[in-house]
């Protein structure tokens, strides 16, 4: 099967890597614009070159390309706890991250919000705090996980989710005769 | 058993409002964040808002900031969505959906959604 191409890539094709073919005449192939440039005016005719100007600040484009305008670059979404990993330049789009012992838990595609790596009090790391995963905690006897923090089973009422995880210390507090049963 | 009951959808104007509601069980409500997803007719889910625990921390997409309101009652058990301002982009099903932190996007569990209409 051919893959559906749309009438931009359609027309990319017929000229050879690196070249466009000129909206206006399609017997001519300009070369592309290289990456951190835009095109500004479109090759005159064959083997001349393509105007390509540089972006502006604010702009960039990441890859060889024949956009009419650069893109503008990303800012960093402090309200989501983000932080600025790298500026933008004219052929990089800002990145943005999260803080030392924070990862991302992604609401879209696109958009990310940083949380505070648990700690682990009160257990153990099972897996460390990852860029996208919270630590896994693994917690002591006693304590129970609720929302990946380690819990005291004091807290823990009838019927919630954690009598099941509490249930042995439960049965502890009975009395040793119980402790050999099955 | 957890189980999740949306509750308020219907037929609005443009420009109208809507109260959200959805009714949670089975589960421990207070430990979770909890949150609204929905889905338009052709479309993928899409996280619309969430809300920690506590209700202190609160997330809202940029398309519905400044018109949607999300809040919670614990000792209901209870989650709610005000929605303001309806545009006919708002049409979708609603869901109400435990937030699973980390990774994403993932759409936690959820109920059997509430269906929310905007046309004049």
């Known amino acids: 099967l051919v893959p559906h191409l749309g009438d931009r890539e359609k027309r990319d094709s017929v000229c050879p890597q690196g070249k466009y073919i000129h909206p206006q005449n399609n017997s001519i192939c300009c070369t592309k614009c290289h990456k951190g440039t835009y095109l500004y005016n479109d090759c005159p005719g064959p083997g001349q070159d393509t105007d390509c100007r540089e972006c502006e600040s604010g702009s960039f484009t990441a890859s060889e390309n024949h956009l009419r305008h650069c893109l503008s670059c990303s800012k960093c979404r402090k309200e989501m706890g983000q932080v600025e990993i790298s500026s933008c330049t004219v052929d990089r789009d800002t990145v943005c991250g999260c803080r030392k012992n924070q990862y991302r838990h992604y609401w879209s595609e696109n958009l990310f919000q940083c949380f505070n790596c648990s700690l682990c009090l009160n257990g153990t790391v099972h897996l460390s705090c990852q860029e996208k995963q919270n630590t896994v905690c693994t917690c002591h006897a006693g304590f129970f996980l609720r929302e990946n923090e380690c819990v005291s089973c004091s807290n823990c009422k009838k019927s919630l989710e954690c009598t099941k995880l509490c249930l042995p210390q439960i049965e502890n507090v009975k009395g040793t005769e119980d402790s050999g049963t099955t | 058993e957890v189980q999740l009951l949306e509750s308020g959808g219907g037929l609005v104007q443009p420009g109208g409002s809507l109260r959200l509601s959805c009714a949670a069980s089975g589960f421990t409500f207070e430990w979770y964040w909890m949150g609204w997803v929905r889905q338009a007719p052709g479309k993928g889910l899409e996280w619309v808002s969430a809300i920690s625990g506590s209700g202190g921390s609160t997330y809202y997409a940029d398309s519905v900031k400044g018109r949607f309101t999300i809040s919670r009652d614990n000792s209901k058990s209870t989650l709610y969505l005000q929605m303001n301002s309806l545009r006919a982009e708002d049409a979708a099903v609603y869901y109400c959906?435990?937030?699973?932190?980390?990774?994403?996007?993932?759409?936690?569990?959820r109920g059997q959604g509430t269906l929310v209409t905007v046309s004049s």
């Open positions: 959906a435990k937030v699973k932190l980390g990774g994403g996007p993932n759409f936690g569990y």
